[in-house]
Amino acid sequence: RGVFRRDAHKSEVAHRFKDLGEENFKALVLIAFAQYLQQCPFEDHVKLVNEVTEFAKTCVADESAENCDKSLHTLFGDKLCTVATLRETYGEMADCCAKQEPERNECFLQHKDDNPNLPRLVRPEVDVMCTAFHDNEETFLKKYLYEIARRHPYFYAPELLFFAKRYKAAFTECCQAADKAACLLPKLDELRDEGKASSAKQRLKCASLQKFGERAFKAWAVARLSQRFPKAEFAEVSKLVTDLTKVHTECCHGDLLECADDRADLAKYICENQDSISSKLKECCEKPLLEKSHCIAEVENDEMPADLPSLAADFVESKDVCKNYAEAKDVFLGMFLYEYARRHPDYSVVLLLRLAKTYETTLEKCCAAADPHECYAKVFDEFKPLVEEPQNLIKQNCELFEQLGEYKFQNALLVRYTKKVPQVSTPTLVEVSRNLGKVGSKCCKHPEAKRMPCAEDYLSVVLNQLCVLHEKTPVSDRVTKCCTESLVNRRPCFSALEVDETYVPKEFNAETFTFHADICTLSEKERQIKKQTALVELVKHKPKATKEQLKAVMDDFAAFVEKCCKADDKETCFAEEGKKLVAASQAALGL
């Protein structure tokens, strides 16, 4: 039983307009259109949104008016298919318009581009931004929604409304401040970093639903909500899981108005039933809608009930295990996952799911055996290596991180992953390895009890980025295998990869290692990316290079950049010293 209204409405568009209000309706339609047609100019999208909004108002006035009974996908799809340059701009995506709903919508969804060919967003001067904000606040905020949505086509739409609200608040406050830049820039940096993290987390949810289905998503949700709400009954957790699955299915399916509406209903339900869910929700539930939903999604785990009995009684020692399992497999496994997760906030969600899978596999085998109880009696012993593997990995990598610091830890991962999957494009390897390396600063500071859920669940998000980027242009069977075989075993699969011995080293190209004076004006982050790009290319040329060899070359490279950036004639320095560096590096690596 879900919390959502099931009553039919004569006009779906009128229903959603009334539920959400004009401001949210327009914002969500803009997000939807920008996520579908990622290359279209801002002005074209605004025009389409205004047309849809005017139409929605006619339906609010009279639900029986012409076309008001059409589904939202029909209305929105018809509108998108009026875009004149569809074939020239989007190629085969234009073929979607020949299909009928709901195939047309799913066709659009399948053409969403995780890595669209769009220019990097360059932040203008603070005064320029403040002037634009004051001149036309509405257009300024719409532009923000548009630019984020087109670059992040799976961004969780109701959460993007929350980001836009914070974006507006930052400008409202800081454009009046004495030192606008000091006030605004840290806030914008925080929004950018949080936004990227939010986008990546949602991308994993959508990938889970797309590639592994509803059951996989529900299992993830049972584990996570049971950790977060350990005092809640199984029936309550199950209900929340059903409703949360509906919300994310809608957003991932492009049903953004329904998704935002249902997310608001779910937040309302949670706050009305706090007493049976969690003691940590009080502050969240006092906030306005967008803040409330965000707060609930991020709320800390409640304390575990004091006297939880041993799990073994119901799931190993009981003579009814196979009977209970046979009667309702998914429910019984769901109860196992709930009971295990609420007792283990110290485990990652993916580990809990591996344990549940092991338990399921054991029951499938043992319940068909001559003596089932004897067969599954030691099932919990099988969990030990599964628990120890991520524990040991996190311990080793946190030690390495503490020894090296973030930048050099990222470099170690760059080398490690380039050797595992050298066919993957250099920009993807740099982006993914940099993000993998951020696990150190993010998680290693935590005490033991919080390290694993922080680290391994974060790594699942980052490896999903690799998977979706690789799916667009598949180049490595090993990546495809790790990405598609099992959602919960992606990280162990990548961890287990050794150096790819079949890889034929890339031909040496001096141009790849030619640098210019423009590197001197880059930010520290951009300069790091340049150096890390060179490091990946080095490994692709010489996959058998030792750590020591690579370190020597990278140290020489850093010194070269530092020297030439201090030189009077920088460009000449880069040209002359660069040639020497390339020759020395070739000699050092035996290229």
Epitope: P102, E103, E106, L109, Q110, C206, L209, Q210, K211, F212, G213, E214, R215, A216, T249, C252, H253, K329, D330
Partner: nanobody, 125 residues
Framework: EVQLVESGGGLVQPGGSLRLSCAAS????????MGWFRQAPGKEREFVSA????????YYADSVKGRFTISRDNSKNTLYLQMNSLRAEDTAVYYC??????????????????WGQGTLVTVSS
């Protein structure tokens, strides 16, 4: 492994009705989504309708909405498609399909792992 066997196809006049059945054997559990697709000669296979085994939620192609009804009988492990007000353009081979994971895109044939052999529906006067 899941086996799907369709029945109920045949020749019918425009405006007439037919009821297709699809018997599923093997391990169909509550996570399944079952669907009907059709393929007319020389055309691509197209989505007709789908139903979630777990909650009974239904999905229809616009071209059949209001004329076709999908349903299932859990006790018999059988899927049905009641087709009313049939038209000449409904002529096709109708396939029953199962997606054991209920993946997000329910109109995409590649997301269905198991297929029946098909049953021919001809609408002609």
């Amino acid at each position: 492994e899941v086996q799907l066997v369709e029945s109920g196809g045949g020749l019918v006049q425009p405006g007439g009705s037919l009821r297709l059945s699809c018997a599923a054997s093997g391990s169909t559990d509550s996570a399944y989504r079952m669907g009907w697709f059709r393929q007319a000669p020389g055309k691509e296979r197209e989505f007709v309708s789908a139903i979630n085994w777990s909650d009974g939620r239904t999905y229809y192609a616009d071209s059949v909405k209001g004329r076709f009804t999908i349903s299932r009988d859990n006790s018999k492990n059988t899927l049905y498609l009641q087709m009313n007000s049939l038209r000449a353009e409904d002529t096709a081979v109708y396939y029953c399909a199962a997606d054991p994971d209920s993946r997000l895109y329910y109109t995409v044939p590649q997301n269905y792992d198991y297929w029946g052999q098909g049953t021919l529906v001809t609408v002609s006067s």
